[in-house]
């Protein structure tokens, strides 16, 4: 069946952009870095220079959910991350601005944003019990939990 | 009313400075964190340079880093923008503002005022 999201009609507005160029790293401190155009991966790394920055955009729901709604862009592109689905990998989407309004389908460019301490976790609005996840030998794709890790630090002012 | 009005512009040679100032009012200053973004003859409009309310963190465009520094004195309502070896590239009309909601999605920028010109030739 289709994703809850998909079925109705939230819309989100774009708010403002809540964080430049921070990095995100796994529990076991894996940076995420390119694999390529499209993929992201994640690898131990020496030199946090070679690591992806992002931005993170703040949406706001129309039917005003206590949830804090985000899309992530590579900082200084217009490659957006976009999740599909599960155990597949999430996917860089060029697009030439921001996203004024995200609905429908568009939804796989959100995700719910949650903090518990220093843990991060992205869950998918198309796919809501699928989180942003790093998996060994793999790209990072969206899981529902272990063995993909599922939680990251932001590590912000690396510049 | 919101109220900025830039200031400090002209003409300068390749290599030379200025500083550019902002005097606003009608809004809690030292409460927002503000920015310059400047528009080249022709071309969109630019995000420059940001700074924190109370100026302990600075932002700054690749192509302005080590030459440009923002400022603000709070206590006067003023923003300043401390432009250093200056090249042609950097004519534009240079404009404060609020920060903009996304520095790289021009729909988002929201500025007041006139601006001031800056030219940079030999």
């Known amino acids: 069946s289709a994703p809850f999201s998909f079925l109705s009609n939230v819309k989100y507005n774009f708010m403002r952009i809540i964080k430049y160029e921070f990095i995100l790293n796994d529990a076991l401190n894996q940076s995420i870095i390119r694999a390529n155009d499209q993929y992201l991966t994640a690898a131990a790394l020496h030199n946090l220079d070679e690591a992806v920055k992002f931005d993170m955009g703040a949406y706001k729901s129309s039917k005003d959910d206590a949830k804090i709604t985000v899309i992530l862009r590579i900082s200084k592109t217009q490659l957006y991350v976009t999740a599909q689905d599960e155990d597949q990998p999430v996917l860089l989407k060029e697009m030439p601005e921001i996203p004024k309004t995200i609905t429908g389908s568009e939804t796989n460019l959100l995700f719910f944003w949650e903090t518990h301490g220093t843990k991060n976790y992205f869950t998918s609005v198309a796919h809501p019990n699928l989180f942003i996840a790093t998996k060994q030998d793999y790209w990072v794709c969206l899981a529902g939990g272990p063995p993909s890790i599922t939680d990251f630090q932001i590590l912000e002012n690396q510049a | 009313e919101v109220q900025l009005l830039e200031s400090g512009g002209g003409l300068v040679q390749p290599g030379g400075s200025l500083r550019l100032s902002c005097a606003a009012s009608?809004?809690?200053?030292?409460?927002?964190?503000m920015a310059w973004v400047r528009q080249a003859p022709g071309k969109g409009l630019e995000w420059v340079s940001s700074i924190t309310p109370s100026g302990a963190a600075t932002y700054y465009a690749d192509s302005v880093k080590g030459r440009f520094t923002i400022s603000r004195d709070n206590s006067k309502n003023t923003l300043y923008l401390q432009m250093n070896s200056l090249r042609a590239e950097d004519t534009a009309v240079y404009y404060c503002?609020?920060?903009?909601?996304?520095?790289?999605?021009?729909?988002?920028?929201?500025?007041w005022g006139q601006g001031t010109l800056v030219t940079v030739s030999s």
């Open positions: 009608g809004f809690t200053f030292d409460r927002y964190i």
């Open positions: 503002a609020e920060e903009p909601a996304d520095r790289y999605s021009t729909w988002t920028f929201d500025y």
